[in-house]
C-alpha cells in the first residue's frame, strides 16, 4: 500500500530546494495545485498555488517560490530559491478539488536550512540564477484559504537521512539507502 512518507533535505542558506510532486494525471492534470507549510499544531498554510485551471509548464512565481505544473507528465515542480534558515519546516503539495477537501500528494518534504556559505556552487545552486530568467507570472487566481482539518497532524518523526553535503544541493552517491519515515499508514 502507498504510504505518506517524508523526505528530508538539508540545505544551506542561499541554496535552492528543487523538488517534484507526482499526481494521477488523468484525474488532476488541470486541477489547481498548491505548496503548503505545516507548522506543529497549526492548519497547513498555503504559500503558493498554480492558476485555476492549472496551465501546462507555465511557471508561477510567488516571492521565492516557483511552481511549474507538467500536466502531460503528472508532475508539479516546486522550487524555493535563496533559502533562509526560517524556511525550515515540513512542506507538502496538495491538489484543490472544491467542494471536496484538498488531496494530499506524496511525499512530504522536511526542509532543514542551516547558516553558512556553501563554498563551491552546489549541484543545482545555479538554479537560483536560472529561476529569474523565467518571466515572473503574477497569478490572478487566489489560493483557496480552506484546508482540511484532517491534514493537521502531530509533528512526524524526523528522518535520519541527512544526505546533503555542504557543497551540493543533494548528493546521494555515498548513501546506500534512504530512510523514509511513514507519517501514518
Amino acid at each position: 500500500a502507498t504510504k505518506l512518507t517524508e523526505e528530508k533535505y538539508e540545505l544551506k542558506e542561499g541554496q535552492t530546494l528543487d523538488v517534484k510532486c507526482d499526481y494521477t494525471l488523468e484525474k488532476f492534470a488541470s486541477s489547481q495545485k498548491a505548496w503548503q507549510i505545516i507548522r506543529d499544531g497549526e492548519m497547513p498554510k498555503t504559500l503558493a498555488c498554480t492558476e485555476r485551471p492549472s496551465k501546462n509548464s507555465h511557471p508561477v512565481q510567488v516571492g521565492r517560490i516557483i511552481l511549474e505544473d507538467y500536466h502531460d507528465h503528472g508532475l508539479l515542480r516546486v522550487r524555493m530559491v535563496n533559502l533562509q534558515v526560517e524556511d525550515s519546516g515540513l512542506y507538502q503539495c496538495v491538489i484543490y478539488q472544491p467542494p471536496k477537501e484538498p488531496h494530499m500528494l506524496f511525499d512530504r518534504i522536511r526542509l532543514v536550512v542551516t547558516k553558512g556559505f556553501s563554498g563551491t556552487p552546489g549541484s543545482n545552486e545555479n538554479s537560483t540564477q536560472n529561476v529569474y530568467k523565467i518571466p515572473p507570472t503574477t497569478t490572478k487566481a487566489l489560493c483557496p484559504l480552506y484546508t482540511s482539518p484532517r491534514t493537521v497532524t502531530q509533528a512526524p518523526p524526523k528522518s535520519t537521512a541527512d544526505v546533503s553535503t555542504p557543497d551540493s544541493e543533494i548528493n546521494l552517491t555515498n548513501v546506500t539507502d534512504i530512510i523514509r519515515v511513514p507519517v501514518f499508514n
Partner: antibody, heavy 123, light 107 residues
Framework: QVQLVQSGAEVKKPGASVKVSCKAS????????INWVRQATGQGLEWMGW????????GSVKKFRDRVTMTRDTSTSTAYMELSSLRSEDTAVYYC????????????????WGQGTLVTVSS | DIQMTQSPSSLSASVGDRVTITCQAS??????LNWYQQKPGKAPKLLIY???NLETGVPSRFSGSGSGTDFTFTISSLQPEDFATYYC?????????FGQGTRLEIK
C-alpha cells in the same frame, strides 16, 4: 548493492504488445523513481518516461503516451513497462533505470541501469 | 523540447591524449546536465552529474564544466578503457533529452 535485473529478449510481430520487467534489489524499491530509456541499434538514448513505485503514478513522453503503460508490483519490487501497437521502429534495447536521489528530488540523473532488454519487432 | 547538440560526433585519439567533448543546449539549462559513458553491448554509466560533479567511483581524469547553454566534458589523459561513446543529458525541464552521442575511437 543496487541491482536492476530485466527480463529476456523478445521477438514480436507488428501490432503486438510487449511487457518488459525490471526486478530491483539492494535498496528500498518504493524510495526511488524508475525511468525507462530505449536505444535503437546504433542510435542514441531516448527517454520514455518515469514511474514512482510508491504512489504508482507515472508519466511518459508524447510520442509514447497512447502506447506505453508503466506499472509496478511492490510485493516483488518489480517495475513493468508495456508497449503496445508495436512497429518496426520500436526495435530497440529497453533499459529500466533508477535515479540518483529521492523520489521527490528534481534530480534526473540516471545512476543505476538494468542490463537492457532487446525487443525486436519483425513480421 | 530542449535540443542537446554534441560535438564532435566522433573523434580519434591516442592513449595519454587530452580529449574534450562539448554539448550545447538550445536554451539555458543552468547546471542541469549529466554525462554518461557507454561501451558496446553495455548499459550507459553515469560519470558526471549536475555539470561538474564526479559520480562516486569514477576516476578523476574525467571532469565536466559549464553552465547555461555550453558544457564541456574532458578526459585529461586517455586510458585504453575510455574508448566508448559519450552522451550528455539535460533535466532542466520535461521532457528529458540526450545529446546524439560522441564516439571516441583509438587513433
Amino acid at each position: 548493492q543496487v541491482q536492476l535485473v530485466q527480463s529476456g529478449a523478445e521477438v514480436k510481430k507488428p501490432g503486438a504488445s510487449v511487457k518488459v520487467s525490471c526486478k530491483a534489489s539492494g535498496y528500498t524499491f518504493t524510495s526511488y523513481d524508475i525511468n525507462w530509456v530505449r536505444q535503437a541499434t546504433g542510435q542514441g538514448l531516448e527517454w520514455m518516461g518515469w514511474m514512482n513505485p510508491n504512489s504508482g503514478n507515472s508519466g511518459s513522453v508524447k510520442k509514447f503516451r497512447d502506447r506505453v503503460t508503466m506499472t509496478r508490483d511492490t510485493s516483488t519490487s518489480t517495475a513493468y513497462m508495456e508497449l503496445s501497437s508495436l512497429r518496426s521502429e520500436d526495435t530497440a534495447v529497453y533499459y529500466c533505470v533508477r535515479l540518483i536521489g529521492y523520489s521527490s528530488a528534481w534530480k534526473w540523473s540516471f545512476q543505476h541501469w538494468g542490463q537492457g532488454t532487446l525487443v525486436t519487432v519483425s513480421s | 523540447d530542449i535540443q542537446m547538440t554534441q560535438s564532435p560526433s566522433s573523434l580519434s585519439a591516442s592513449v595519454g591524449d587530452r580529449v574534450t567533448i562539448t554539448c550545447q543546449a538550445s536554451r539555458d539549462i543552468s547546471k542541469y546536465l549529466n554525462w554518461y559513458q557507454q561501451k558496446p553491448g553495455k548499459a550507459p554509466k553515469l560519470l558526471i552529474y549536475d555539470a561538474s560533479n564526479l559520480e562516486t567511483g569514477v576516476p578523476s581524469r574525467f571532469s565536466g564544466s559549464g553552465s547555461g547553454t555550453d558544457f564541456t566534458f574532458t578526459i585529461s589523459s586517455l586510458q585504453p578503457e575510455d574508448f566508448a561513446t559519450y552522451y550528455c543529458q539535460h533535466y532542466d525541464n520535461i521532457p528529458i533529452t540526450f545529446g546524439q552521442g560522441t564516439r571516441l575511437e583509438i587513433k
